[in-house]
């Protein structure tokens, strides 16, 4: 019962129908499943196709403009679990413009192990806010279900039974609400005893085997597992391959001689990308780790005495690293034979990621080219990088090609970093927060000082939007009143003292000290910072009696905090080198002073004997609150209210019942309501700028996958016909 | 047919110990998780404690955890409860039960005819 | 912990009545709930499994419904043996816990 079929490699199936059919036997994809441009298919051309054998896929499935699929449902109506050993941009199941398809419909979906779900521009997709995905992976934060039809709150999604008017399908909670949980109009979503865990259970409940995974046809029985939570041996879910088995794909177990099969067909075919597996820790792998190389007589991995080569040859000589995904193609890579172009725009934890993927190349034997790299500050994730052959040169015989990387900060440290640069030369152009004199160090340490033409270092286009300045000035004097900072700092003069033509002093509102000099600053013009030019002091040629520079800072807001800082402004030498200083940030808070008045006091009377009196804190604390004084005074009382009969049965009870006033705390809600009350002739609010932010954030995001997916979708058309099982990308 | 007799009930002083037994008889015990039940008197009925077929698992109500420990010997077809701590809440009868399956599902039939612990001064 | 509240606590009825039992979950559960029959000095019995499945042996005029958080059980023909108290279990998580149980008696 347990993986009743074959077990097939990954597949790529896409243009038409034909290669669709392979699956027809397969109980497991041992890789990924790709179904994708199929322009010309139509709703009937799915009609009878079904493949009711396969269970589990082990990396991911994709789904990518197949015209005319509707459903799932009898596609793959028994697919139980999706491994997600491998992820397609971090996704286990990618559901991407699929123009037609109206429900997911994979109602024996029980499990995606790792990775997380991508469903996007399905305009007809309907069946998503039925299921509960929770039920189904454990990262559902990470879920991206956008732009469907389902977010038009168009989906009439009816669960087996609602027409009826009874509740066939298990009803669970997600953000409050309490759903019937439902894949299609006639199937439930399995929903298991929380004991269960992930393992799956039978119709009534019982919990199938603690080694199952997903689904079973008997409770508590190994052997009746419909897919396996660890390793799969001979119709039997093993906790963990017992000798003489080893650990294969993380689901199975095989023995030496599969293993050595694998090994012999890849050295003896001349494909590229297959592997020469290898056994490791019990593991049957594609290679060894970083550290092991291969004992050749039993193909165990054996640790390497000192560093090990491991020589990575880059198709077409070149390789573009532009997100993670590519860059852990060269883990454990020691020497690139070949160029690498670095175009790194975003990411998450990407300083960690490329030093695990990259830092142990030591050596390239071309060139190496950082390009638009956004996302990158330092180049300090080559850790090992010592050599760059520049035995392939970029067009213009660079060896070194850095251009328009807006926040690349740092090469390397030179101090603890040697890199040696056999030939070529290098080449910096729109580099803004690049300092020349870090260039110029690059130069020196590489050997490369003297090869550079007049154009090739640009003089203006680096480090023309950082601090380059040299020698730190240092504040010599900090005095502080409520609405003034009076600041002074040590003279500086450069080697010519007719080159400084003052000083800039930079300062804004900063409640947290974490600000750093080019917040706020943008490519058009914006600056956060108010900035005050101040000409230099009078020069005295007694260095004892130098006069300290300084400003009176007026204006200020009380009981608030300053980022400051100073730096000079010295004229532009030609000579390729700038003098001049620059104060680190310092943060100064202005004294305390009198708040204003306190805002919107409301007293009302709820007894005989009391006055509640509430207020709002005043718009301006101007310092901390400790406490408030309140003032009272008692009033004559007016005559009327002695002389008036309380008996006559004309006088009415007050009409107003005694509402505790608003909390002050909660001003905006207050005013909220306010606008709320106008007959909803409200406008909508501003987006606050971290909303904002968001939404760039959001659409980039959208924009990398996009480029993602078609970059691994979209691959020239290869002339010989012939694709093997390893394969990753047939075309 | 399968029986489930409990004994080693009685009366016990406050912080007192005890330990109850339940003999099985009738099905392959190894094969099936075990549970007790309580029944303070005239009161309803409260899980105390779980274990699956094997022992490898066992699971407690928050009522008893630290204080109770339950166990199984499959080569003798007896389950265990042995009670630490004892306090005068812990005044019930005390049923073993037999589980579906031998995952702890909280399915409980058959049940034993019950051994009723004291815990006074 | 998953609380379950039985409704209603005690109930009268006739023999050839049909009677209804409620239990409520705090938090939904499914259909993970058994129900219990326990006639005085005796331990309980199954009757129901899985919200609305018929123990063997169990006569067929007990019958469960429900799902999520609300469950009924229902004697469709009270018998004179019949009469005993009923509670409702969950079996979707540890610890699983009982409904304080509904006595039923005769009229």
């Known amino acids: 019962h347990l993986y009743p079929g074959e077990v097939c490699p990954g597949m790529d199936i896409r243009n038409n129908l034909t290669r669709l059919h392979e699956l027809e036997n397969c109980s497991v994809i041992e890789g990924h499943l790709q179904i994708l441009l199929m322009f010309k298919t139509r709703p009937e051309d799915f009609r009878d196709l079904s493949f009711p054998k396969l269970i589990m896929i082990t990396d991911y499935l994709l789904l990518f403009r197949v015209y005319g699929l509707e459903s799932l449902k009898d596609l793959f109506p028994n697919l139980t679990v999706i491994r997600g050993s491998r992820l397609f941009f971090n996704y286990a199941l990618v559901i991407f413009e699929m123009v037609h398809l109206k429900e997911l419909g994979l109602y024996n979906l029980m499990n995606i192990t790792r990775g997380s779900v991508r469903i996007e521009k399905n305009n007809e997709l309907c069946y998503l806010a039925t299921i509960d995905w929770s039920r189904i992976l454990d990262s559902v934060e990470d879920n991206y279900i956008v732009l469907n039809k389902d977010d038009n709150e168009e989906c009439g999604d009816i669960c087996p039974g609602t027409a009826k008017g009874k509740t066939n399908c298990p009803a669970t909670v997600i953000n409050g609400q309490f759903v019937e949980r439902c894949w299609t109009h006639s199937h439930c979503q399995k929903v298991c005893p929380t004991i269960c865990k992930s393992h799956g259970c039978t119709a009534e409940g019982l919990c199938c085997h603690s080694e199952c995974l997903g689904n079973c046809s008997q409770p508590d029985d190994p052997t009746k597992c419909v897919a396996c939570r660890n390793f799969y041996l001979d119709g039997r879910c093993v906790e963990t391959c017992p000798p003489p088995y080893y650990h294969f794909q993380d689901w199975r177990c095989v023995n030496f001689s599969f293993c050595q099969d694998l090994h012999h067909k890849c050295k003896n075919s001349r494909r590229q990308g297959c592997h020469q597996y290898v056994i490791h820790n019990n593991k049957c792998i594609p290679e060894c780790p970083s550290g092991y190389t291969m004992n050749s007589s039993n193909l165990l991995c054996t640790p390497c005495l000192g560093p090990c080569p491991k020589v990575c040859h880059l198709l077409e000589g070149e390789k573009t690293i532009d997100s993670v995904t590519s860059a852990q193609e060269l883990r454990g890579c020691t020497v690139i034979n070949g160029s690498l172009i670095i175009n790194i725009r975003g990411g998450n934890n990407l300083a960690a990621e490329l030093e695990a993927n990259l830092g142990l190349i030591e050596e390239i034997s071309g060139y190496l080219k950082i390009r638009r790299s956004y996302a990158l500050v330092s180049l300090s994730f080559f850790r090992k990088l010592r050599l760059i052959r520049g035995e392939t040169l970029e067009i213009g015989n660079y060896s070194f090609y850095a251009l328009d990387n807006q926040n690349l900060r740092q090469l390397w440290d030179w101090s603890k970093h040697n890199l040696t640069i056999t030939q070529g030369k290098l080449f910096f152009h729109y580099n803004p927060k690049l300092c020349l004199s870090e260039i110029h160090k690059m130069e020196e340490v590489s050997g490369t000082k003297g090869r550079q033409e007049r154009n090739d270092i640009a003089l203006k286009t680096n480090g023309d939007q950082a601090s380059c300045e040299n020698e730190l000035l240092k504040f010599s004097y900090i005095r502080t009143s409520f609405d003034k900072i009076l600041l002074r700092w040590e003279p500086y003069w450069p080697p010519d003292f007719r080159d400084l033509l003052g000083f800039m002093l930079f300062y804004k509102e900063a409640p947290y000290q974490n600000v750093t000099e080019f917040d706020g600053q943008d490519a058009c013009g914006s600056n956060s910072w108010t900035v005050v030019d101040i000409d230099p002091p009078l020069r005295s040629n007694d260095p004892k009696s130098q006069n300290h520079p300084g400003w009176l800072m007026r204006g200020l807001k009380p009981w608030t905090q300053y980022a400051i800082f100073v730096k000079t402004l010295v004229t532009f030498s030609d000579e390729r080198r700038t003098y001049g200083a620059k104060s680190d940030i310092i943060y100064v808070q202005t004294d305390a002073t009198n708040p204003s008045v306190p805002l919107d006091p409301i007293s009302v009377s709820n007894s005989s004997s009391q006055i509640i009196l509430k207020w709002k804190p005043p718009s301006d604390p101007n310092g901390n609150i400790t406490h408030y004084l309140v003032f009272w005074e008692r009033q004559a009382e007016d005559s009327e209210l002695f002389e008036l009969d309380y008996c006559l049965k004309g006088l009415k009870l007050p009409s107003r019942t005694w509402s505790p006033p608003f909390e002050s705390e909660d001003s905006q809600k207050h005013n909220q309501s306010e606008y709320e009350d106008s007959a909803g002739e409200c406008c909508s609010c501003p987006k606050t700028d971290s909303q904002i932010l968001k939404e760039l954030e959001e659409s980039s995001f959208r924009k990398t996958f996009e480029d993602y997916l078609h970059n691994v979708v979209f691959v020239p058309r290869k002339t010989s016909s012939g694709t093997g099982a390893e394969d990753p990308r047939p075309s | 047919q399968v029986q489930l007799v409990e004994s080693g009930g009685g009366l016990v002083q406050p912080g007192g110990s005890l330990r109850l037994s339940c003999a099985a008889s009738?099905?392959?015990?190894?094969?099936?998780?075990m549970s007790w039940v309580r029944q303070a008197p005239g009161k309803g009925l409260e899980w105390v404690s779980a274990i699956s077929g094997s022992g490898g698992s066992t699971y407690y109500a928050d009522s008893v955890k630290g204080r109770f420990t339950i166990s199984r010997d499959n080569s003798k077809n007896t389950l265990y409860l042995q009670m630490n701590s004892l306090r005068a809440e812990d005044t019930a009868v005390y049923y073993c039960?037999?589980?579906?399956?031998?995952?702890?599902?909280?399915?409980?039939?058959?049940w034993g005819q019950g051994t009723l612990v004291t815990v006074s001064s | 912990a998953i609380q379950l509240t039985q409704s209603p606590s005690s109930l009268s009825a006739s023999v050839g009545d049909r009677v209804t039992i409620s239990c409520r979950a705090s938090?939904?559960?499914?259909?993970?709930l058994n129900w219990y029959q326990q006639k005085p000095g005796k331990a309980p019995n199954l009757l129901i499994y899985?919200?609305?499945s018929l123990q063997s042996g169990v006569p067929s005029r007990f019958s469960g419904s429900g799902s999520g958080t609300d469950f009924t059980l229902t004697i469709a023909g009270l018998q004179p043996e019949d009469f005993a108290t009923y509670y409702c279990?969950?079996?979707?998580?540890?610890?699983?816990?009982f409904g304080g149980g509904t006595k039923l008696e005769i009229k």
């Open positions: 279990q969950q079996f979707d998580s540890y610890p699983f816990t």
């Open positions: 899985a919200a609305s």
């Open positions: 039960a037999k589980d579906r399956v031998g995952a702890a599902n909280g399915w409980f039939d058959p």
């Open positions: 938090q939904s559960i499914t259909s993970y």
């Open positions: 009738g099905f392959t015990f190894s094969s099936y998780a």
